[in-house]
């Protein structure tokens, strides 16, 4: 059963990057408002974003409580504003979201190369360990803290003077690669979770090249 003057939400979509998680839906409301509820498969429905005219709801605070749980959300529609109404007609209309498991589905954010250091024919490239909104003991965990060895980084590197790319992989946040003496190199990294079936890879980081600010060079 539903309420006159309202339409159900549709196109419920999870938008999640590094566990920052927003539920989006349509349509833009006309004389109606929305309330969102979120639940784990075994849990209770918790109301969030009460009576909002937005078509999105930030559910990060809820999903970071246990990123390995599977969540379901639903969006309720209520008549509102200066509409003819003589009391509530049963339960409001609602629509369910797809299931969402943050650990398996959150998009990996674009990584950043924190620094690179050349020592002779070796270059150490360090990837910034992005902070997430997942907490443990009142401190925010990094992406590495959350994913551990499930997360790897792929480094793409090439001589500034050529286009032939080489790759390296690490399950830490550091690479140590061999380079030709006297050559400048460019670097880009990508975060990867090989065990995933969806959203396995991030976009590539911005390119950083030797001879620019980020690096430190020590010829030995």
């Amino acid at each position: 059963s539903g309420t006159t003057n309202t339409v159900a939400a549709y196109n419920l979509t999870w938008k999640s990057t590094n566990f920052k998680t927003i539920l989006e839906w349509e349509p833009k409301p006309v004389n109606q408002v929305y309330t969102v509820q979120i639940s784990t498969k075994s849990g209770d429905w918790k109301s969030k974003c009460f009576y909002t005219t937005d078509t999105e709801c930030d559910l990060t605070d809820e999903i970071v409580k246990d990123v390995k749980q599977t969540y379901l959300a639903r969006v309720f529609s209520y008549p509102a504003g200066n509409v003819e109404s003589t009391g509530s007609a049963g339960e409001p209309l609602y629509e369910n979201s797809p299931e969402f498991t943050p650990y398996l589905e959150t998009n990996l954010g674009q990584p950043t190369i924190q620094s690179f250091e050349q020592v002779g024919t070796k270059v150490n490239v360090t990837v910034e360990d992005e902070r997430t909104l997942v907490r443990r003991n009142n401190t925010f965990l990094s992406l590495r803290d959350v994913f551990g060895k499930d997360l790897i980084y792929t480094l793409y590197y090439w001589k500034s003077s050529s286009s032939g790319k080489k790759t390296a992989k690490t399950n830490t946040n550091e690479f140590l690669i061999d380079v030709d003496k006297g050559e400048n190199y460019c670097f880009s990294v990508q975060a990867v979770i090989p065990s995933r079936t969806v959203n396995r890879k991030s976009t590539d980081s911005p390119v950083e090249c030797m001879g620019q600010e980020k690096g430190e060079f020590r010829e030995i």
Epitope: W45, F50, Y51, Y78, G81, E84, P92
Partner: antibody, heavy 118, light 106 residues
């Protein structure tokens, strides 16, 4: 049907604490936000804070921060509001109230009168 | 915090008369809620989301408004309507209530 039954009237000394209970029935206690609102004699209403019994998530009005603690016991379907460092201005009727259709203050307890007097 | 100012504080009217209660917000809010309270009783939800009558509220009641100005209207007062009415907002934290309008029998 939804019922919220509150504990009886209390008389307290300034500086002491009071703990008011609100026993819920007729619904799944852990699935709904519970709010506390008070009304001083002859005055308007004031939101104190809220709790989601499912996970203990709570929020408080800054005016009461540090003096109020709202808890919930899922095993007995009871919410509690404890107010400390009482002063005469805290004399009021305290209500628990639950979210419902189209309204966050949809169902109300009968109220508990707390009198703070020396 | 949002301050809600209700006017008048007291209305003395006879049964059958029309009553319009006003609620003015210190900043624009999305929706207004109204509660009816009788002596020695808890408030009861009366109008929600500006214009929706709560369950069991007679059709002689209506609510409207937007932004900072909202109103509750009783088209023809009946004996059971004499009570105090409070407006309330939760567009911004903390939720706040107006000081109330008492509708008494003239």
């Amino acid at each position: 049907q939804v019922q919220l039954v509150q504990s009886g009237a209390e008389v307290k000394r300034p500086g002491s604490s009071v703990k008011v209970s609100c026993k819920a029935s007729g619904y799944t206690f852990s699935s709904y936000w519970m709010y506390w609102v008070r009304q001083a004699p002859g005055q308007g209403l004031e939101w104190i804070g809220q709790i989601y019994p499912g996970d203990g998530d709570s929020n408080y009005n800054e005016n009461f921060q540090g003096r109020v603690t709202i808890t919930a016991d899922k095993s007995t379907s009871t919410a509690y509001m404890e107010l400390s460092s009482l002063r005469s201005e805290d004399t009021a009727v305290y209500y628990c109230t639950r979210e419902g259709y189209g309204n966050r203050f949809a169902y109300w307890g009968q109220g508990t009168l707390v009198t703070v007097s020396s | 915090e949002i301050v809600l100012t209700q006017s008048p504080a007291l209305m003395s009217l006879s049964p059958g008369e029309r009553a319009t209660l006003s609620c003015s917000a210190s900043s624009s809010v999305s929706y207004m809620y109204w509660y009816q309270q009788k002596p020695r009783s808890a408030p009861r939800p009366w109008i929600q989301l500006t214009s929706n009558l709560a369950s069991g509220v007679p059709a002689r009641f209506s609510g409207r408004g937007s932004g900072t100005d909202f109103s509750l209207t009783i088209s023809s007062l009946e004996a059971e309507d004499f009570a105090t009415y409070y407006c309330q907002q939760w567009s911004y934290n903390p939720p706040t209530f107006g000081g109330g309008t008492k509708v008494e029998i003239k």
